[in-house]
Interface confidence: low
């Protein structure tokens, strides 16, 4: 696995100082030329001897992180991440300070890279014995041990084949994506392949680990295999999605399809610096690779996304929860799972596509035809979430070319909106992941215009809270999305509801576990609502027989969602009236022992209505959907009694799940109503019509 072995070098301090003095001015200059450490080293050593070493900032504790998958760890190389506002000069000084303090203890270290542009920090080769010391350095936020990342494709068949023509009914403009530049972080590529010749610029960026062992002698066609195929899928002349997109390739994976987190970080930094030096149109970055969960890789992706770059990544081929992998688990990245021609999740050997709440959508990823590096006119079929991600990168390039001003949030919502819904056979996924995994397969929009009028919303699931009595789970929307409603779900039914609360100047959705519960999920409904002003109105438990009620009382504010939260362990069987009084659509109704929260929003032309579907008899699932032209913003259940497992939105349908009460024989407790709040924006519709 190409681990960097780091051996302790026993250099006692007096001997080290003596060596530096013996080197004299000429020797000192040579030393500085090599690693730039000579003067700083001596000064730091002296200041430490005098007790003048700078202490870490008071009250902050830096943390150490490493890959949970042991075989993928690369001990001996560490990414030291510094606090957000740390300047480059401070990063360099901190790195040198580490070297000096290490030398004093008899260890040699090597600074491999100093990060700036995306994240402040440095990459250091050192003994793990020095971690405790490094964590105490000033400015240090956290340290992460380097780890491996892998290409996420499998070459199924290697025969040379002619690519099929796209179906006539598929929207395929010949120059789609022409305003967009797609960066590919992958293996080397065969840039003279006729599929991609003249479309891909090979940058001089290369940061790859040595190949493992000597069994794999570098062979160009093998080394280029993965990257060439993906470049062809994105923008190939015959088999590409966005035939007009131009691409730039960075080599971060070696001939075995293996790279490192640190190499990928340096690649992302390279892209950010290129973007600053020469700003172009919209940028898409394709990361067809996966490694174990990495805080630093996710953080770098977040920074790049917030700089206006669209990142698309492979969910991973491990038939596992994508949240356990990076960059798939980064919320700012568009994470793509793989399906086959029958819209089934792709099986890859004994494994298959990843799944779960960190996947945004699926795309074709089995037997995908693309450029083969075996010759300049060869084609090959490959499978994996890399291929699926390449499809979505191509679709993103098409959309951005048609609407260059789209933000990441707008692009993600459009990708979701135009996807084929509910076509994947969910039985393939583990039972506990089915509800969390989006049943969406990416598709090109029917035309590149005409989406402007739509109110776009998506469902965001939190991580699981864990089972402790006071455990909570939090779901968040993207920075430029509005949280329009909040719901919760527990498989055991033991929960204490949910509420919207302000966190860092933004509303978040928090769900509460109950005593004896196995844990809860918070479910946020996140929407694109320009110029919106939203607030939460709360009514404490009423204790009255009619239950607790709250409404939107501000002029021009409409109800977009209802939440309820209770402190008692069991709400019992009290049943408030299922149908709310006529003429009061802006009202949330709930259990008398619960506090009720109404999400109330004012936005130009926003109108909403409440839609209910009640079932008098016990049923495990009750649904209600919004009509064409309306978008589901809120989904909740009436009543909030303990047999209701929770409510959540699936596309434009509100789903309320209940425990199977048929065995109890209590039909009064079995009655459940699904309450949907459906909204539309007349303002967006008018603006769209004016454009057309």
């Amino acid at each position: 696995m190409g681990t960097v072995s780091s051996r302790r070098s026993w250099w006692p301090l007096p001997l080290l100082l003596l060596l530096l003095l013996l080197l004299g001015p000429a020797g000192a200059r040579a030393q500085e030329d090599e690693d730039g450490d000579y003067e700083e080293l001596v000064l730091a050593l002296r200041s430490e001897e005098d007790g003048l070493a700078e202490a870490p900032e008071h009250g902050t504790t830096a943390t150490f992180h490493r890959c949970a998958k042991d075989p993928w760890r690369l001990p001996g190389t560490y990414v030291v991440v510094l606090k957000e506002e740390t300047h480059l000069s401070q990063s360099e000084r901190t790195a040198r300070r580490l070297q000096a303090q290490a030398a004093r203890r008899g260890y040699l270290t090597k600074i491999l890279h100093v990060f700036h542009g995306l994240l402040p920090g440095f990459l250091v080769k050192m003994s793990g014995d020095l971690l405790e010391l490094a964590l105490k350095l000033p400015h240090v936020d956290y340290i992460e041990e380097d780890s491996s990342v892998f290409a996420q494709s499998i070459p199924w068949n290697l025969e040379r084949i002619t690519p099929p023509r796209y179906r006539a009914d598929e929207y395929q403009p010949p120059d789609g994506g022409s305003l967009v530049e797609v960066y590919l972080l992958d293996t080397s590529i065969q840039s003279d392949h006729r599929e991609i010749e003249g479309r891909v610029m090979v940058t001089d960026f290369e940061n790859v680990p040595e190949e493992d062992g000597t069994r794999f002698h570098r062979q160009a066609s093998k080394c280029d295999s993965h990257g060439t195929h993906l470049a062809g899928v994105v923008s190939g002349r015959d088999a590409g999605v966005a035939k007009g997109a131009s691409m730039r390739s960075l080599r971060v994976l070696n001939c075995q399809g293996k790279g490192t987190v640190s190499g990928t970080l340096i690649g992302l930094e390279f892209i950010r610096k290129s973007q600053l030096v020469q700003p172009v149109g919209p940028l898409v970055v394709l990361l067809p690779l996966a490694g174990g969960y990495s805080r630093v890789l996710n953080a770098a992706c977040q920074r790049l996304a917030r700089a206006g770059v669209v990142l698309v990544t492979a969910a991973g081929n491990f038939r596992d929860d994508a949240c356990l992998y990076s960059p798939a688990s980064a919320p700012e990245v568009i994470t793509v799972g793989a399906t086959n021609a029958q819209d089934q999740p792709v099986t890859l050997g004994t494994l298959g596509t990843n799944f779960g709440r960190c996947v945004d959508l699926f795309a074709p990823g089995e037997d995908i035809i693309g450029a083969s590096s075996d010759c300049s006119t060869c084609f090959v079929s490959q499978s994996g979430t890399s291929q699926a991600a390449a499809h979505v990168a191509g679709i993103a390039a098409m959309m951005l070319s048609a609407e260059p001003e789209l933000t990441l949030a707008e692009l993600r919502q459009r990708l979701i909106h135009f996807s084929a819904k509910d076509v994947i056979n969910e039985a393939w996924f583990p039972e506990d992941q089915r509800v969390l995994t989006p049943n969406l397969v990416a598709a090109l929009p029917p035309s590149t215009h005409g989406a402007g009028w739509q109110l776009f919303c998506r469902t965001v699931w939190s991580a699981h809270s864990g089972p402790t009595r006071m455990a909570t789970a939090v779901a968040r929307c993207a920075p430029d999305e509005e949280l329009l409603s909040c719901s919760s779900f527990s498989r055991s039914g033991k929960r204490r509801g949910e509420r919207m609360e302000a966190q860092g100047g933004k509303l978040v959705c928090r769900a509460h576990n109950a005593f004896g519960g196995e844990g809860v999920y918070a479910i946020a409904r996140c929407c694109l609502l320009p110029q919106a002003n939203c607030s939460v109105h709360t009514a404490p438990p009423a204790e009255a027989s009619m239950g607790t009620r709250v409404h939107c009382h501000q002029q021009g504010h409409v109800l977009t969602g209802c939440s309820s939260h209770w402190e008692v362990e069991d709400l019992g069987t009290h049943k408030p009236p299922v149908l709310r009084p006529r003429g009061q659509p802006n009202q949330c109704v709930g259990h008398r022992e619960a506090s009720i929260h109404a999400s109330c929003c004012h936005a130009p032309g926003l109108e909403c209505k409440v839609k209910e579907h009640g079932i008098p008899a016990p049923q495990e699932q009750v649904t209600v959907a919004c009509e064409e032209g309306w978008t589901l913003t809120g989904c909740s259940a009436l009543p909030g009694t303990s047999h209701v497992l929770g409510a959540y939105a699936v596309d434009n349908t509100c789903v309320v799940r209940s425990r199977d009460v048929s065995t109890t024989g209590s039909t009064s407790e079995g009655a459940v109503t699904a309450v949907a709040i459906c909204c539309r924006s007349r303002h967006l519709a008018q603006a769209s019509q004016e454009l057309q």
Epitope: M1, N157, Q219
Partner: antibody, heavy 123, light 111 residues
């Protein structure tokens, strides 16, 4: 059903040759690296040779280097082991084994095995 | 041919845990190469149990778990059952050989 079936084993005199075959079915043979592994009677497993999916990479154990030749025919879904200058210590049950795909994070693992073919070298 | 070293045999009563070690060198296990574990019942072909140190193959019960530290990998069988009686082999890639290397094998007996 994914299956590997070895054939070609038998009794042979020292110094003579033998050719083993392995027929693959139930998977895309041309996508996988393949290996031969042997097991002497009452002994442990010994890796003999490996070949990548397109025959670009071939490697042998020191004990058979220069005497054995591994090859494959993707069109026929078949793997071969040509064994020359056979010795008594080559007596073993020879297994054909499929290796995890090239781009897997866990390459070198043998996920599918045949039932083996017995080679006895004796005068 | 250098081999990975395993104990010749280990035994345990039903329900107990047993651990099999697999010691290599910096050229194989210690060099960061993956370690895989196989189970072989008498007269049968080996079966891949754990790949990449920790990933169980499909259908393998979670009683089987793997770990690695330095030049040594380990396979632990917790809650030993009668059907676990078999030979177990570790395997890794060896950089100096440009090929795979197997462990000497461990005979697990359920008392």
């Amino acid at each position: 059903e994914v299956q590997l079936v070895e054939s070609g084993g038998g009794l042979v005199q020292p110094g003579r040759s033998l050719r083993l075959s392995c027929a693959a079915s139930g998977f895309t043979f041309s996508s996988y690296s393949m290996n031969w592994v042997r097991q002497a009677p009452g002994k442990g497993l010994e890796w003999v040779s490996g070949i990548s999916s397109s025959s670009s990479y071939i490697s042998y154990a020191d004990s058979v280097q220069g005497r054995f030749t591994i090859s494959r025919d993707n069109g026929k879904n078949s793997l071969y082991l040509q064994m020359n200058s056979l010795r008594a210590e080559d007596t073993a049950l020879y297994f054909c084994a499929r290796e995890y795909d090239f781009w897997s994070a866990y390459y070198d693992a043998f996920d599918v095995w045949g039932q083996g073919t017995m080679v006895t070298v004796s005068s | 041919q250098s081999e990975l070293t395993q104990p010749r045999s280990v035994s345990g009563s039903p329900g107990q845990s047993v651990t099999i070690s697999c010691t290599g060198t910096s050229r194989n296990i210690g060099g960061g190469n993956d370690v895989h574990w196989y189970q072989q019942h008498p007269g049968k072909a080996p079966k891949l149990l754990i790949s990449g140190v920790i990933e169980r193959s499909s259908g393998v019960p979670d009683r089987f778990s793997g770990s690695k530290s330095g030049n040594t990998a380990s396979l632990t069988i917790s809650g030993l059952q009668a059907e676990d009686e078999a030979d177990y082999y570790c395997q890794s890639f060896d950089g100096s050989l440009s090929g795979s290397v197997f462990g000497t094998g461990t005979d697990v007996t359920v008392l």
